[in-house]
């Protein structure tokens, strides 16, 4: 008997051939011997069975001896032995019918669990096998799950159904709803204008929901909310901001926000959560501000950095276009009595520059100039 | 009082075109699927396509297959074969058909002479 799988909701096409190659009569049957379908003269004849409507035949091959069953919109219980009677011929084909589906939504929140499940039809005993779009496999019976999904997890899930040495792929999109960035940095000098950027993994057609950042600075003892706000349809909306500092938000997507200055007071973490309709759970994102001062009191130049930075940076005090004077893994260095000329404060990773600041010291008989 | 009514038949030189239409009443046509047969000259009646009731799914004997479009428009219960191309050999009385039976529905057919 020949086997046939099938997918639930997907069009499935039974062979039946005869020797003659001509358009003769034929009759397909299930296994309770109720007629489906057949042809009598130049019409497609169907009988009184479930499929009724979901039944069909194509007449283009009927004149070359073949005479297919085709289902429309499989349904798990269309699994059965299909008989097709031709030529005083009886042909069998088993067809067997699966349906995989996502537990609940196929959009889930980063670090939520995925559930797979698997409806067979009785008697069945397969075996399924997925892929995730980053190449893990996972395998199990009638149900699989993935917990802790990451933004890798994103995208097309192939899972492959075995049954009878055959095989039926279905492929799964699953969308895992995160910040692209679960971390970021941002390094400015003092007084400057701070950009911060919370861009989306996903793009999805109605985003709402409301949002939060909370602060919590170097110098205080405690966080504090700087902004919250609405997203309706992709449009922000500003519900309620702190008079210091006076932040300033995007209207549209990607969230954005501005920091009219940078300043020592302002340097810290910050937690911005993301709350979307209809979903349990919040999407954060993590948010670091580094500030640099650089300044001369009286005779000694002073470079100072605040915020979180790792303990393997290096604040440098040089003078330009010579070695540092001063280099150290701390967030202050200085220089006492500094020879006139340009001098640079730099933080630096590993050799690479991550803020800059310069101040003039003027001969001693002046003020100093901080360009 | 169900009624099939073909029209769009006629003289044409081969390489031409020409459209059928058949005409449906009597029944609910949008729940049909349909076909279109011909019957050559001294010869036996032959299917030539199917559509289904949506008008999604259609089907054509393979040698008119590219060269004949079926289609049908259900707010018009209109029921239409496009044929391009046409050679001597589709000269015949075109005919009209529920695909299946039950109903069985024809139409009377419509004459299609292909000649120079």
């Known amino acids: 008997k020949k086997v046939v799988l099938g997918k639930k909701g997907d069009t499935v096409e039974l062979t039946c051939t005869a020797s003659q190659k001509k358009s003769i009569q034929f009759h397909w049957k299930n296994s309770n011997q109720i007629k489906i379908l057949g042809n009598q003269g130049s019409f497609l004849t169907k009988g009184p069975s479930k499929l009724n409507d979901r039944a069909d035949s194509r007449r283009s091959l009927w004149d070359q001896g073949n005479f297919p069953l085709i289902i429309k919109n499989l349904k798990i219980e269309d699994s059965d032995t299909y008989i097709c009677e031709v030529e005083d011929q009886k042909e069998e084909v088993q067809l067997l019918v699966f349906g995989l589906t996502a537990n609940s939504d196929t959009h889930l929140l980063q670090g939520q669990s995925l559930t797979l499940t698997l409806e067979s039809p009785p008697g069945s005993s397969p075996s399924v096998q997925c892929r995730s779009p980053r190449g893990k496999n996972i395998q199990g019976g009638k149900t699989l799950s993935v917990s802790q999904l990451e933004l890798q997890d994103s995208g097309t899930w192939t899972c492959t159904v075995l049954q009878n040495q055959k095989k039926v792929e279905f492929k799964i999109d699953i969308v895992v709803l995160a910040f692209q960035k679960a971390s970021s940095i941002v390094y400015k000098k003092e007084g400057e204008q701070v950009e911060f950027s919370f861009p989306l993994a996903f793009t999805v057609e109605k985003l709402t929901g409301s949002g939060e950042l909370w602060w919590q600075a170097e110098r205080a003892s405690s966080s504090k909310s700087w902004i919250t706000f609405d997203l309706k349809n992709k449009e922000v909306s500003v519900k309620r901001v702190t008079q210091d500092p006076k932040l300033q938000m995007g209207k549209k997507l990607p969230l954005h926000l501005t920091l009219p200055q940078a300043l020592p007071q302002y340097a810290g973490s910050g937690n911005l959560t993301l709350a979307l309709e209809a979903k349990t759970g919040k999407l954060h994102q993590e948010v670091n501000l580094v500030v640099m001062r650089a300044t001369q009191l009286q005779k000694n130049l002073t470079c100072e950095v605040w915020g979180p930075t790792s303990p393997k940076l290096m604040l440098s005090l040089k003078l330009e276009n010579k070695e540092a004077k001063v280099s150290k893994r701390e967030k202050a260095v200085w220089v006492l009595n500094p020879e006139a000329g340009m001098w640079q404060c730099l933080l630096s990773d590993s050799g690479q520059v991550l803020l800059e600041s310069n101040i003039k010291v003027l001969p001693t008989w002046s003020t100093p100039v901080q360009p | 009082e169900v009624q099939l009514v073909e029209s769009g038949g006629g003289l044409v030189q081969p390489g031409g075109s020409l459209r059928l239409s058949c005409a449906a009443s009597?029944?609910?046509?949008?729940?049909?699927?349909m076909s279109w047969h011909r019957e050559p000259p001294g010869r036996g009646r032959e299917w030539l396509a199917d559509?289904?009731?949506?008008?999604?799914?259609?089907d054509y004997l393979a040698s008119v297959r590219g060269r004949f479009t079926i289609s049908r428009d259900n707010a018009r219960n209109t029921l239409y074969l496009q044929m391009d191309s046409l050679r001597s050999e589709d000269t015949g009385v075109y005919y009209c058909?529920?695909?299946?039976?039950?109903?069985?529905?024809w139409g009377q057919g419509t004459q299609v002479t292909v000649s120079s």
């Open positions: 559509i289904d009731s949506s008008g999604d799914t259609t």
């Open positions: 058909a529920s695909r299946e039976d039950p109903p069985g529905y």
């Open positions: 009597g029944f609910t046509f949008s729940r049909l699927a």
